[in-house]
Amino acid sequence: YDFTNCDFEKIKAAYLSTISKDLITYMSGTKSTEFNNTVSCSNRPHCLTEIQSLTFNPTAGCASLAKEMFAMKTKAALAIWCPGYSETQINATQAMKKRRKRKVTTNKCLEQVSQLQGLWRRFNRPLLKQQ
């Protein structure tokens, strides 16, 4: 999906009002310096691509983020403010097996959500030059 035509300010508002708090809740009990940010993005569409990938694509050691509150809010925000996104997700959902994954918080998941926090922060500061 090409995120170029999203309403970035609306997505930013959703992040600031709710998604950011859910990410903090998920990370509660973890030191902010515990994980190094290794994933970066260069502009808002690129950031959303990386955010979608880290949030919804299962990875080794962390297969359970899609059921978290921040993930559901992220998906809904993209569906509302990115034209055509919801249709791509509906089609993808219908091709998926209907299988409920048990929610498990692993250290790998915490690291992944830490990366997500960094991507979201970068998304909110699109005019900053990358280090």
Partner: nanobody, 114 residues
């Protein structure tokens, strides 16, 4: 197996109101994303409003200030109050619970016409 049943659609004049209901059965309605989608003839299905179990809500620009989404956990039911309806709101409206698991209702037709 989760079942979703929408009701409340119908024919209404421009400027009128309707209240859609979505009754969920066979599930626990406590940790959820609940969305109202709509699909107009020849168009893609679009998410117009969403509510989450913590009470936060999203609205598409086209309906903000006119539509209100809510949920009654005790009745396992979600609602979409639609005011100041416009002809462009004409569509089949679907509710979806936790759409990652493909839980969809059958849809209810809303026609706004004089």
């Amino acid at each position: 197996e989760v079942q979703l049943v929408e009701s409340g659609g119908g024919l209404v004049q421009p400027g009128g109101s309707l209240r859609l209901s979505c009754a969920a059965s066979g599930c626990i309605f406590s940790t959820y994303f609940m969305g109202w989608f709509r699909q107009a003839p020849g168009k893609e299905r679009e998410l117009v409003s969403a509510i989450f179990s913590d009470g936060s809500t999203y609205y598409a620009d086209s309906v903000k200030g006119r539509f209100t989404i809510s949920a009654d956990n005790s009745k396992n039911t979600a609602y979409l109050q639609m005011n100041s309806l416009k002809p462009e709101d004409t569509a089949v409206y679907y509710c979806a619970l936790d759409w990652n698991l493909n839980r969809w209702g059958q849809g209810t037709l809303v026609t706004v016409s004089s």
